[in-house]
């Protein structure tokens, strides 16, 4: 997260981290007592190794009472996400046991009327990912306050020139902006899930090349297809 | 398929009013910016500006920022370029082009010509 | 405003030739974003533009790959690698890096 500040401890209990081989890869989001949410790409390069989550978490070295490291069952990607596009980064982490719920770790409602967010609207972004262009990485959880962009400001030539469809949207980045490290993490706008991190390589802080986010409520039929 | 189609063009004398249409279908209409650009009679291109569907936000070349107005009805998916105080000079083919991705997708132009 | 001119204003070629239009900027069309916003653009009489090249060297879908584009800064370059009778028609280059966005003044290539 860049140009935002440390997250009030344990205030986001659906907040996850996919971790790989003990490592922070990404964040996720806990939609279901054994299901979190998270972004297709980030486990493309994860063939040969140990996919894992962390729920309950602040400090991702400190410990702490809440915090709990669940293997993974199932990584269920979108069926149609291709490693070179944006669309469809979405993907679902079957936990290998329901997750324990307390004040720590709690599912999040996600949206599920397709209707775009008001431009201008503030989203909350948290995460563990980068927090300067050094790429220095934070122990403590994350997070920022963005705008929602309007998708034609987000399609035009100097921003997106027209990648944003229907199914993603954008989130101002000047300065302040999820980054590297923070994909597979929740855009909540108004206490529900709105968005995912998307996992492309993007430039960050950069206030023409706006964040981007999957909505959710595009993939409502998938994600209720996949936790049945 | 992204379409959009121009009409309203004609023959105007100098001083007179004209609105263009263009009417955008295949797409979702607030998704993109649309921009409207002319050509003169064996002459280049030259954009007049830009509108957000959203917003309605604009931005126009200098030269057109007295005479010409842009609008919306997003309820039709419909830009409109509104010229006012035509001179001959003003004779040209006009395009609407969706913004996204570049200038991919055009109009097929409506020829104005001013003339008494 | 940035102008660009185009160089030849017109040329004649012959099948299977290889053409080069330049275009040159009054000033850098690098956007403060790091990107440069340099198309190229294919028209036919009576029709609308097609899109061929953007951000520089970028072929657009669908566009043959006899068509490319280079340069930097304030020189760019549209090369078609072996001209085909359908090539036959007026380019235009384009900067969208700075508003008020313009074009090239047309280069027409003719048959000779």
């Known amino acids: 997260i860049l140009g935002g500040r440390e997250a009030e401890a344990h205030a986001r209990p659906y907040m996850a981290s996919v971790q790989l081989n003990g490592a922070h890869l990404c964040g996720g989001v806990l939609v279901a007592e054994q299901w979190v949410l998270s972004a297709a790409h980030c486990l493309e390069d994860a063939a040969d190794g140990k996919v894992q989550v962390l729920l309950g978490a602040h400090s991702l070295s400190q410990p702490e009472p809440s915090k709990r490291l669940y293997d993974v069952l199932r990584a269920v990607p979108h069926p149609d996400s291709q490693p070179d596009t944006i669309d469809h980064d979405l993907l679902l982490l079957q936990l290998s046991e329901k997750a324990t719920l307390g004040p720590a770790v709690r599912p999040l409602p996600w949206q599920r009327v397709d209707r775009d967010v008001a431009p201008g609207t503030l989203c909350d972004v948290a995460g563990w990912g980068i927090v300067n262009h050094a790429g220095r990485r934070p122990d403590s959880l994350q997070h920022v306050l963005l705008p929602v962009l309007d998708r034609a400001t987000c399609n035009r030539r100097t921003h997106h020139d027209g990648a944003i469809t229907e199914r993603l949207m954008c989130a101002e980045s000047n300065r302040r902006d999820s980054c590297k490290g923070d994909s597979g993490g929740p855009l909540v706008c108004g206490g529900v899930l709105e968005g995912v991190v998307t996992s492309g390589s993007r430039v960050c802080g950069n206030r023409k090349k706006p964040g981007i986010y999957t909505r959710v409520a595009s993939y409502a039929a998938w994600i209720d297809s996949v936790l049945a | 398929e992204v379409q959009l189609v121009e009409s309203g063009g004609g023959l105007v004398q100098p001083g007179g009013s004209l609105r263009l249409s263009c009417a955008a279908s295949g797409y979702i209409f607030t998704s993109y910016y649309m921009n409207w650009v002319r050509q003169a009679p064996g002459k280049g291109l030259e954009w007049i500006g830009d509108?957000?569907?959203?917003?309605?936000?604009?931005d126009y070349n200098a030269d057109f920022k007295r005479r010409f107005t842009f609008s919306l009805d997003t309820s039709k998916s419909t830009a409109y370029l509104q010229m006012n105080s035509l001179r001959a000079e003003d004779t040209a083919v006009y395009y609407c082009?969706?913004?996204?991705?570049?200038?991919?997708?055009w109009g097929q132009g409506t020829l104005v010509t001013v003339s008494s | 405003d940035i102008q660009l001119t185009q160089s030849p204003s017109s040329l004649s070629a012959s099948v299977g030739d290889r053409v080069t239009i330049t275009c040159r900027s009054s000033?850098?069309?690098?956007?403060?974003?790091?990107?440069?916003?340099l198309e190229w653009y294919q028209q036919k009489p009576g029709k609308a533009p097609n899109l061929l090249i953007y951000k520089v060297s970028n072929r657009f879908s669908g566009v043959p790959s006899r068509f490319s584009g280079s340069g930097s800064g304030t020189d760019f370059t549209l090369t078609i690698s072996s001209l085909q009778p359908e090539d036959f028609a007026t380019y235009y280059c384009f900067q969208g890096s700075h508003v008020p966005v313009t074009f090239g003044q047309g280069t027409k290539v003719e048959i000779k």
């Open positions: 082009t969706r913004e996204g991705p570049s200038f991919a997708y």
């Open positions: 000033q850098t069309i690098v956007h403060s974003n790091g990107d440069t916003y």
């Open positions: 509108i957000n569907p959203v917003t309605g936000d604009t």
